[in-house]
Structure formats: structure tokens, C-alpha cells
Interface confidence: low
Amino acid sequence: KSPVFGPQEVSSVEGNSVSIKCYYPPTSVNRHTRKYWCRKGASGRCITLVSSEGYVSSNYAGRANLTNFPENGTFVVNIAQLSRDDSGHYKCGLGINSRGLSFDVSLEVSQGPELPNGTEVYTVDVGRTVTIKCPFKTENAPKTKALYKKIGQTSVLVIDSRNYVNPNYKDRIRLRIPGTGQLIFTVVIDRLRLSDHGLYLCQAGDGSNRDEKNADLQVLEPEPELVYEDLRGSVTFHCALGLEVANVAKFLCRVNSRETCDVVINTLGKRDSAFEGRILLNPQDKDGSFSVVITGLRKEDEGRYLCGAHSDGQLQEGWPIQAWQLFVNEESTIPRSPTVVKGVAGGSVAVLCPYNPKESQSLKYWCLWEGAQNGRCPLLVESQGLVQEQYEGRLSLLQEPGNGTFTVILNQLTTQDAGFYWCLTNGDTRWRTTVEIKIIEGEPNLKVPGNVTAVLGETLNIPCHFPCKFSSYEKYWCKWSNTGCQTLPSQDEGPSEAFVNCDENSRLVSLTLNPVTRADEGWYWCGVKQGHFYGETAAVYVAVEEKKVAGSRYVSPAKADAAPDEKVLDSGVREIENKAIQDPRLFAEEKVVADTGDQAGGSRASVDSSSSEEQGGSSK
């Protein structure tokens, strides 16, 4: 399908002008190639009428032009002094007329209505309010005032000053007679319907002395605003319906093939399941305006959308609406990234978030989509640090790999972490994307102690076990803070091929803190990565306590807590289960015994990639 998009139908009246906007993917080639507007003939050929290269056909001379806006990926065709002969089928496109990079546009120019002299024309959108002004002479001030609608040769009474109201206008019309001295009465019609369209007659008095005034009411369906967005990107519909419906329920719906409108989301809590996790209806402002954001755009999201207000939260005739025609461009600049990321309880996920690479300095955010009410997305973390304290020790946003992608790591997963998350920046809003985290059955691949207590001034060694499938990955330990995870200096142990054979004895990367200081308290992550792409992580909390006096029940020397599946021969350490710790204080009894060996010349913190045997433990 062609990526060029424009209005399918354009209608106007003789003598008027039209402006037709066509959209195209703003690639370098497209921005500079020829743009054209051509008319389809009976033979199927499309004859150029105006192009971006300056050509204007004789029929369009002096009344048409084509302007390219390469920075927006749009071009606009303006045609003035329309005649009935301009009605027909056209194409707006790029390149050569016959190439198919085009969009079909139907233009209909109709004859303007023949109106009686002195007719006042009122042009109002459906659902809105019109006030028809009816002047009268002093002698008719005390006499009956009325508004009629002309239908063919007959006039049907709509409302009069004797309290008559035509049933078709019940509860939405009023006739106002001003105070003395004002020689004008008004008729106000609310919630206009398409059927209200037509010629009306104001009348004051009767007989040959009566005052009459014609009013032509044109009730228009709102012209849909064209919206051109990239596949996988995001769209925002801003809906401003006016103060008169500020306190009425709002909705966004999508027109279906039967020309009815299916609710996408409304303020009464209804939401189409196809938009689960990727839609927000932002709380409305005092003036009743609101906006709906949809992320993770799919080709099937294309179509005509209406927003409106009605107490039922769905489309009803005679209530104000706004319209959009959404086109989803498959030649997207937004890269593919997983829309579902799976993790196991106790394990971790690393989520890749795309952003506009031209905006590398923009602030990056990650939020959790909540479906309650109209949907909202509390920020969890941003590129300058953690936002939500309950994610302390298990959530980090990294600028890597960069160049249009950042990474979010969440570990110590529980079933409560399942859900939809949004990647955001404070820059280009069209790059908002959605990812779903699913928690599946399984065991974490990286195994670390549940939590450890280190003794001040002594040496601490924390093991992290990994399976053979990670043998070619880079292993690291880092210290978590609410502004990131600072990688700890690594101490090479032996040749870099240490893990090539991946036998039972070469699956351990350990962290050494020597000597332990108060500042060492906190969360530590063990992780694997390939270049700038992060894999799994496991977290452990290190508490620091004073050295125990003689008689302490802690035995030394020993190493840190064993990994969950590891039996330890040292007397001071017991086998522990793998826990996803969120509050280390809950596990204060689970101590790790520090090595009291000679610390002279030892490094403050180091990471060892070595075998279990070298650590003095044994593997199962």
C-alpha cells in the first residue's frame, strides 16, 4: 500500500477555494523528489495539473499552486475559483504520476444554494449551538414571535412565544425575547443535528405588517483532521468540545464499516481490549478538553476516530464531536523492538526502548501503565534517577546502547511486575512505545545469595553463579544507586578463554570488597552483557555491621553466602534459598561471614571470574 496519505473526499461550493494536504514519509529521497497533483481521465491516465517543479496547467493558471513542506513530510495543493467542472477524481503523489506513490482524492464542487435576498447564513458544526437573530419593528413588539422551517413549499412551526416547541427540537431550543427597547428576538438551538440543516424563517406579528427574516442554517459534519503517524509510534488526539459539555462524559470511538462508532475509551471506564496497555485518556481540564494518547500503533489502528461528549459515553446524534482520519505509515522510522519481554519470578528483564536518535540529550523515562479509571502512567524511573522509592535496588535506566535506544533493567521480579510499561522522552512524543512484561514459569539463570551481612574492616566475597549459555558473555558486578549502577573494577584471573569449555568449575563470577567500609552497604547487581546490550541481572543486598567481640556465634574464616543451589563445606555458612529481597531488614538473621585473613595491599573492591574450587566451595 502506498505510504502517501491525504483526504479521500473534498467538497466545496462554486466560487470557493480548497486546500488539500498530502502526507509522505519524510525520507531524504522523498523530501526532494517531485510532488504532483493530477486528474484521472477516462483512459486511466493521470494528467498533471500542478507540480512542485513549477508546472501549472492552463486550466489552473492563476488559481492553483503546490507547496512542499519537506521538514513536515507534507505538501499542500491550493485551488481557488472552483467551478462545477472541477468535480472529479484526482491523485496527489510523489515522483512519476504512474508509479503508485500516490493517494486518490475525490473532489466534489456543488452549486451554492439559491437563497432569498437578505438571508443570513449560519454555518455550524453538528452538536454545537446556533443563535439565530430575528429583528422586528416596534409595532410587532407585543405580537407573537415564531421560527419556521421551510420544507419544500411548506413552513413548519419550530417554536413560538406561546410556548409551542416542535417535538423534533424538544429540550434543545429556546426563544428569547429581550427587554423593552431591544427590537430583536433570538432563537437558540443546542446540540445541532444534521437534520436541522435548511432554510428557516423568523416571524414577528401577522398579516401584511409582519416582520420576516430568512436564515440559512448549514449543519456540517466536522472535517476530519488528517493524522499521519509511524507504525509502532504514538498518536495524541486533543479533543476540545467546549464548556457547554465540560461536565458530560467524554469518549473516543472508531468508525466501523457499518458507519457506527465503536468506543475505544471513555470517561465512564469503558476501554476496547485491543488498546489494553497502550492507551491513556488524560484527565480533562476545566474547559472540558481532554486528550487520548495511543502508543504502539499498528496498521489495524488506521481509520476514522471521533471524540465526543454524551452522558452514555458513546456517540449520539446532536452532540458535539471532533474527527480525525488516522493513517499508519508502514515505512516507519521507529525501529522494531520486542513488544513482549518475558522474565521469571526472582529473575530480571532488560527492556530496550527506542527514542528519536536526533534527541540524544532528551530526558528518558519509564512508566507503568495503569488501567484503572481512564488509564494513567506513573513514572518509575528517569534518566536522572529513580522516581518511585518502592523500586529501590531493582530498577535502573541506562543510556546504553545509545544512538536511538536506551535500556531499562528490572530485577527481583514478582508476578506483580507483570503488566504494560511505556518508554518516554521529553522530546518527540511520537516515539512513545509500549512493552508488556510477562512473568513465566522458570528459575533465574543467575544465582546470588539472598542477602549478606559484611563485617566492617574485613574482606567480603560474594559469588554469582551463571549457566554455560552465558560463557561467552561479559560478566560484571555493579553497585546500584538511584542514579544508575556503577560497575566495580574487575580483577582478571587467568586467561580470557577461562569459560570456553564451561565445565562445572568455571561458572562463577565473584565480588570482593576489601576492606569492607560503611559506604559499601547497599544493593549490588551481578549481570551479563554483550557489548552495550544487557542481559540478565541478579541483586543482593549487603548490610554492614561492626566486628563482633569474642564469643560471637559467627565462625570464621569463611566466604560469603553460597549461591542457592550450592552446598557449602565451610562451617560458618549455610545453604540458603533464592529470595527476591525488597526489604533487606526482613532477613537480618541471614548473615555472611567475612574473611579475616591478611588484608594488606588488597583492593577495595574487585570482581573475580574464577572457578568454584578456587573459592573453596563445591558444586552440586
Partner: nanobody, 124 residues
Framework: EVQLVESGGGLVQAGGSLRLSCAAS????????MGWFRQAPGKEREFVAR????????DYADSVKGRFTISRDNAKNTVYLQMNSLKPEDTAVYYC?????????????????WGQGTLVTVSS
């Protein structure tokens, strides 16, 4: 969580001006939508103004449009409310609020962080 402290309130004559400040501590507020609300004696707390993260988008209650201006200085972690042409009906306790919600519009329910308030009295 962010802590917010308002200042700049006081007694002023009708037609006069005041500038309220809201200083944030505990974390940077450059990711927060910030707002001002007010509560007159015996009335509900009402929206006055809001400003987005970057300061590029602002909204005002109809009753203060054209008279009040909200602004922010992310470097100073501070939000301001410049109040001109004050009227007696502007008398209220003014509260500064912050929202970490990703939301284009915000009602008072969407603000998670609140200051203690500063009293503005406009005499006729």
C-alpha cells in the same frame, strides 16, 4: 518523595501583586508536572495553574487567566506563581503540588506531592 515548601504569601491590597515560590527538595522536579491550587475558607481546593516538565505548556483556571503566570526554574528546583491585579476573591491558602504522572492534564487527584501552603490575603 519530593518535599515542597511555599513562600511569598502575605497581605496585599486589591490591584496589587505577589510572587509565590515553591522550593523542592528531596529530588529534582524536572520530571514533575507542577501546579498551584488554592483553598478559600469553607470552600473546596481548586485548580489555579499547571506547568509541564519543560515549561513549554501551561494551563490556567478561567478566573486567573491573564492575571497569573506560572513558571519554573529546573536548575533552582523551584516553581513560581506571579499574581497581578489581585482581587479580594483571590484570598486563599495557596498550595504547590507536584505530579510524577505522565499526563497531559492534571486534576488535584493526580498530584502526589503537596506543600503545606502559604496564605494570600487581598484586602479591598
Amino acid at each position: 518523595e519530593v518535599q515542597l515548601v511555599e513562600s511569598g504569601g502575605g497581605l496585599v491590597q486589591a490591584g496589587g501583586s505577589l510572587r509565590l515560590s515553591c522550593a523542592a527538595s528531596g529530588r529534582t522536579i524536572n520530571t514533575y508536572v507542577m501546579g498551584w491550587f488554592r483553598q478559600a475558607p469553607g470552600k473546596e481546593r481548586e485548580f489555579v495553574a499547571r506547568i509541564d516538565w519543560s515549561g513549554s505548556s501551561t494551563d490556567y483556571a478561567d478566573s486567573v487567566k491573564g492575571r497569573f503566570t506560572i513558571s519554573r526554574d529546573n536548575a533552582k528546583n523551584t516553581v513560581y506563581l506571579q499574581m497581578n491585579s489581585l482581587k479580594p476573591e483571590d484570598t486563599a491558602v495557596y498550595y504547590c503540588a507536584g505530579s510524577a504522572y505522565y499526563s497531559g492534564y492534571v486534576t488535584h487527584r493526580d498530584f502526589g506531592s503537596w506543600g503545606q501552603g502559604t496564605l494570600v490575603t487581598v484586602s479591598s
